[in-house]
């Protein structure tokens, strides 16, 4: 059974994951982002079901494509590079989903834009956090 300390750690990791996903989304939605139109042409796979931590496997599998799309930003100066954000997200995802069981991700038939994709995983984090609090 999960202890209160392990639940607290999971909650904190989810909060950090949520914050970085929201940060990426905010940067993309910035009306001054000249690459937004191009970014929206890329399609992402959405999970058929995302209700448990093991379903983060579906996010993990899309992190490389996400980084490639974020690289389109090509800002003159990055405080954080796309690879910094994706690296941190990857570490958190690996810790949250665990490596004991191998879960085969099932994707929905419809693909999504980067904005829809990020919003889906933001909602996932918020949903899981709400069950822990």
């Amino acid at each position: 059974a999960p202890t209160s300390s392990s639940t607290k750690k999971t909650q904190l990791q989810l909060e950090h994951l949520l914050l970085d996903l929201q940060m990426i989304l905010n940067g993309i939605n910035n009306y001054k982002n000249p690459k937004l139109t191009r970014m929206l042409t890329f399609k992402f796979y959405m999970p058929k079901k995302a209700t448990e931590l093991k379903h983060l496997q579906c996010l993990e599998e899309e992190l490389k494509p996400l980084e490639e799309v974020l690289n389109l930003a090509q800002s003159k100066n990055f405080h954080l590079r796309p690879r910094d954000l994706i690296s941190n997200i990857n570490v958190i995802v690996l810790e949250l989903k665990g490596s004991e069981t191998t879960f085969m991700c099932e994707y929905a038939d419809e693909t999504a834009t980067i904005v829809e994709f990020l919003n889906r995983w933001i909602t996932f984090c918020q949903s899981i956090i709400s069950t822990l609090t």
Epitope: N30, A73, N77, H79, L80, D84, N88
Partner: nanobody, 119 residues
């Protein structure tokens, strides 16, 4: 408006350590990047390290393995632990607060704190 108050600068011998702190106040959003840039005499402003509220970090190659950035989200404070300091680390260190991972005109900057590494 966001106000940034830095502390922890000073004079230190080569090989020594310093810890810089920067507290943000005002119109703070939970989703942000805080970090440190520096400007050496006669040089341009350069990134030292930055950290997101979610814990993503970026370090300049020149400080990797020597400097560690961390933050306390509850206190809106960012820290820079500087170890194994070298004379070339001498500069004015500026705290930065941004709402995005890339630079734009909404970024905020502190007044700067002097770090001098000399024997």
């Amino acid at each position: 408006e966001v106000q940034l108050v830095e502390s922890g600068g000073g004079l230190v011998q080569p090989g020594g350590s310093l810890r810089l702190s920067c507290a943000a106040s005002g119109s703070i959003f939970s989703i942000n990047v805080m970090g440190w840039y520096r400007q050496a005499p006669g040089k341009g402003l350069e990134l030292v390290a930055a950290i997101s509220s979610g814990g993503s970090t970026n370090y300049a190659d020149s400080v990797k393995g020597r400097f560690t950035i961390s933050r306390d989200n509850a206190k809106n404070t960012v820290y820079l632990q500087m170890n194994s300091l070298k004379p070339e680390d001498t500069a004015v260190y500026y705290c930065m607060y941004a709402s995005s991972w890339y630079e734009d005109e909404t970024d905020y900057w502190g007044q700067g704190t002097q770090v001098t590494v000399s024997s």
